[in-house]
């Protein structure tokens, strides 16, 4: 039975050209995390695997950095980065947990920062 829950940064905003940390946290389960996939819509951004470490998808290598932890740092943000991001936790024995984050990249110099895990 899947008892875990994923806490995410929720809806967040950031300035064009800046950086943002996407962060999810799995709690309330003793399941082991085999792998975390980060996806933007249906496109793979990155993988963090318990046995093999980090992989950043080639098309994002220049602007995506692993961490902190199982999170992901997006750099040199553009307006095109606005959209939904998903952290997909593949766990054993529970199965798959998915968290959603909505990022809005603003042209303005004043970006409202959302919930937790933000870069100040």
């Amino acid at each position: 039975m899947m008892t875990g829950t994923i806490e995410t940064t929720g809806n967040i905003s950031a300035e064009k050209g800046g950086s943002i940390i996407l962060q999810c946290h799995l709690s309330s389960t003793t399941a082991q995390v085999t792998q975390v996939n980060w996806e933007q819509q249906d496109q793979l951004l990155a993988i963090c695997n318990a046995d093999l470490g980090w992989h950043i998808s080639p098309s994002f290598k220049d602007r995506v950095a692993p961490g902190p932890g199982l999170g992901l740092t997006l750099q040199s943000l553009t307006v095109n980065d606005t959209g939904e991001y998903f952290c997909i936790y593949h766990t054993y024995p529970d199965g798959t947990y998915t968290g959603r984050i909505f990022l809005e990249v603003l042209e303005s110099s004043v970006a409202e920062h959302g919930a937790r895990f933000q870069i100040p």
Partner: antibody, heavy 120, light 110 residues
Framework: EMQLLESGGGLVQPGGSLRLSCAAS????????MSWVRQAPGKGLEWVSL????????YYADSVKGRFTISRDNSKNTLYLQMNSLRAEDTAIYYC?????????????WGQGTTVTVSS | QSVLTQPPSASGTPGQRVTISCSGS????????VSWYQQLPGTAPKLLIY???QRPSGVPDRFSGSKSGTSASLAISGLQSEDEADYYC???????????FGGGTKLTVL
């Protein structure tokens, strides 16, 4: 359609070397962990080696450790297996295999295999 | 000797249900995923089951996988003559940091 095509097999003398190649098509090669698996005549399947996405992590079966080297060229969508100090017991069909996006799930696509015969 | 233990042979008649077992340990089957492969004579292995009980698209629902503790099993219901093949269980071994295969089970359809 996802495809793997092995080449480079042949007849080689004990102590000799051989380099196998596996050309991948139909998927984003960079995003997947790859393995080599072999099958001696009339025997079962035996895992040989695994390589992560960019080649910085590799694992080997004890039977080939120190003699075989797995590598990949993501720009050419190609997986390699360099086999040195070959022995009669290395005679087998060698298959390359693509793993699921979560590599621990197993291997979902296999090539047709290339035959290696070690004999004097 | 294989790290995972399978019976060397199994048999059944058309329409029957056949189960193939695979026994391992805490470092592979009990705490990891199991996949099953079918190898028809003279061909490359084909994936039947992954993630212990998931079937890839294109694999008939006559094939099912299950797992309990350090053992896994593959069940084939409504056995057909084309199911005659070798079947292998596989798991990632966390301690050995290697893929471990069962020795294979030769299924004969009588």
């Amino acid at each position: 359609e996802m495809q793997l095509l092995e080449s480079g097999g042949g007849l080689v003398q004990p102590g000799g070397s051989l380099r196998l190649s596996c050309a991948a098509s139909g998927f984003t090669f960079d995003d997947y962990v790859m393995s080599w698996v072999r099958q001696a005549p009339g025997k079962g399947l035996e895992w040989v080696s695994l390589i992560n996405w960019n080649g910085d992590k590799t694992y080997y079966a004890d039977s080939v450790k120190g003699r075989f080297t797995i590598s990949r060229d993501n720009s050419k969508n190609t997986l390699y297996l360099q086999m040195n100090s070959l022995r009669a017991e290395d005679t087998a069909i060698y298959y390359c295999a693509k793993h699921w996006i979560v590599f621990q799930y197993g291997m979902d696509v296999w090539g047709q295999g290339t035959t290696v015969t070690v004999s004097s | 000797q294989s790290v995972l233990t399978q019976p060397p042979s199994a048999s059944g008649t058309p329409g029957q249900r056949v189960t193939i077992s695979c026994s391992g340990s805490i470092s592979n089957i009990e705490t990891k995923y199991v996949s099953w492969y079918q190898q028809l004579p003279g061909t490359a292995p084909k994936l039947l089951i992954y993630n212990s009980d998931q079937r890839p698209s294109g694999v008939p629902d006559r094939f099912s996988g299950s797992k309990s503790g350090t053992s896994a099993s593959l069940a084939i219901s409504g056995l057909q003559s084309e199911d005659e093949a070798d079947y292998y269980c596989v798991s990632w071994d966390a301690s050995l940091k290697s893929w471990v295969f069962g020795g294979g089970t030769k299924l004969t359809v009588l």
